[in-house]
């Protein structure tokens, strides 16, 4: 794995422990919480990042309307079970034997049940809508410039191929970034849209996951883009299964 060889750190994940105990004395980094080896040349999976976070000490309408099946992460943080590849296991349970099914970004997609609950497969989140509201500025941003800057950010910082950034919508002060990635489209080595969205979310909140780098300084033609609210909607390849009680609540 590529890590900064000189001081043996993980540029893409500060929630790691690194030591030169890899093959040939190479720097090897392991995620906190899981102890799993991570590839420091790319983004760490959201599951391993959440696990590490839980183990750390506690301290005209152009905009898209999310579909009725869109999920929002209302459950917040939990200590997830990850598979050997670092992906979320389809079924997650807490210490009190309450279980639920999650999608590929770890968001609950069923009602909670007991240990008998079955989650047959990990359902892929293929469409993510990142809804941002920026702080007031002298004037609206130029849509084309904003589009280019956000695409550049996802390409260069999060290594997401631009073909997975389906659209950038803007209706001052709301910005929406649509990420789309079908299973058939995702090749080996491609960053997952769920991981890119999570890194972006943490950057926007001033909680960068990158090692020793300054926080995100987003500018459009030199004008700072400061986000004051973020909402993320997740759409799965198979709609979620919630009881009517939840849907009418």
């Amino acid at each position: 794995h590529t890590a900064a060889q000189d001081n043996c750190t993980c540029p893409t994940n500060k929630m790691t422990v690194c030591s030169p105990d890899g093959p040939g004395g190479r720097c090897q980094c392991r995620a906190l919480g899981s102890g799993m080896a991570v590839d420091c040349s790319t983004l760490t999976s959201k599951c391993l990042l959440l696990k590490a976070r839980m183990s750390a000490p506690k301290n005209a309408r152009t905009l898209v309307r999310p579909s009725e099946h869109a999920l929002v992460d209302n459950d917040g943080l939990y200590d997830p079970d990850c598979d050997p590849e670092g992906r979320f296991k389809a079924r997650q349970c807490n210490q009190t034997s309450v279980c639920w099914c999650v999608n590929s970004v770890g968001v609950r997609r069923t009602d909670k049940g007991d240990l008998s609950l079955r989650c047959d497969e990990l359902v892929r989140t293929h469409h993510i809508l990142i809804d941002l509201r920026h702080r007031p500025t002298a004037g609206a941003f130029n849509h084309s410039d904003l589009d280019a800057e956000l695409r550049r950010l996802f390409r260069e910082r999060y290594r997401l191929h631009p073909k997975f950034v389906a659209a950038v919508h803007y209706e001052q002060p709301t910005i929406q970034i649509e990420l789309r990635q079908n299973t058939s489209q995702k090749a080996a080595g491609d960053v997952d849209i769920g991981d890119a969205a999570y890194y972006f979310e943490r950057d926007i909140k001033g909680e960068s996951l990158f090692q020793g780098r300054g926080g995100l300084d987003l500018r459009v033609r030199g004008e700072p883009l400061q986000v004051e609210r973020t909402l993320i909607y997740y759409l799965d390849e198979i709609p979620p299964k919630f009881s009517m009680k939840r849907l009418t609540a």
Epitope: S41, R155, E156, A166, E178
Partner: antibody, heavy 118, light 111 residues
Framework: QVQLQQSGAELVRPGVSVKISCKGS????????MNWVKQSHAKSLEWIGV????????NYNQKFKGKATMTVDKSSSTAYMELARLTSEDSAIYYC???????????WGQGTSVTVSS | DIVLTQSPVFLAVSLGQRATISCRAS??????????MHWYQQKPGQPPKLLIY???NLESGIPARFSGSGSRTDFTLTINPVEADDVETYYC?????????FGGGTKLEIE
């Protein structure tokens, strides 16, 4: 304004290596990846690879693996490409080009001519 | 690799007329409504210069005489009206899939 300044022409013997440079100015160097492109009479334009100036690692065209090695020096805003074990097939003009919107190549260096001759 | 075939290889047009250059990809270069096809102009002794990105978006500073169109596998660069300064070689390039590839080029001449 954005500028990519490449090193001068090279006349080299077969079997040796050559390292060419590309210095970026007029923009934040680590905000954009840097492509390298080969232009020869026989093959038109060929993409050699791209280096992430943010991460410092490179992605190569399979055809140029083992032939080209890309590096970056963030402190001097300079990208480098070393070509190894040169043959007459490597005689060409080599361009650096900034990775732009939708992975286009929006700014190009003036080119470095490499001539391999005994 | 995605192969890009440009036609014609040579194109002769009169000043003030329309020039149309075609680029055909061996497979689709579209993703969610975005076409990963770009056009460049190259003058002798100079590097290529980006004219059009994402099939139809005019790069900043490029005259509106240049336009691009197309989707999936078939793309067109149009110059209307042609001026004397446009007598150059034009290339298409796809960035949908690695490795990015270029067309073989179209040389524009004045008849």
């Amino acid at each position: 304004q954005v500028q990519l300044q490449q090193s001068g022409a090279e006349l080299v013997r077969p079997g040796v290596s050559v390292k060419i440079s590309c210095k970026g100015s007029g923009y934040t160097f680590t905000d954009y990846g840097m492509n390298w492109v080969k232009q020869s009479h026989a093959k038109s334009l060929e993409w050699i690879g791209v280096i992430s100036t943010f991460y410092g690692d490179a992605n190569y065209n399979q055809k140029f693996k083992g032939k080209a090695t890309m590096t970056v020096d963030k402190s001097s805003s300079t990208a480098y490409m070393e070509l190894a074990r040169l043959t007459s097939e490597d005689s060409a003009i080599y361009y650096c080009a900034r990775r732009g919107n939708y992975d286009s190549m929006d700014y190009w260096g003036q080119g470095t001519s490499v001539t391999v001759s005994s | 690799d995605i192969v890009l075939t440009q036609s014609p290889v040579f194109l002769a047009v009169s000043l003030g007329q329309r020039a149309t250059i075609s680029c055909r990809a061996s497979e689709s270069v579209d993703s969610y409504g975005n076409s990963f096809m770009h056009w460049y102009q190259q003058k002798p002794g100079q590097p290529p210069k980006l004219l059009i990105y994402r099939a139809s978006n005019l790069e900043s500073g490029i005259p509106a005489r240049f336009s691009g169109s197309g989707s999936r596998t078939d793309f067109t660069l149009t110059i209307n009206p042609v001026e004397a300064d446009d007598v150059e070689t034009y290339y298409c390039q796809q960035s949908y899939e690695d490795p990015p590839t270029f067309g073989g080029g179209t040389k524009l001449e004045i008849e």
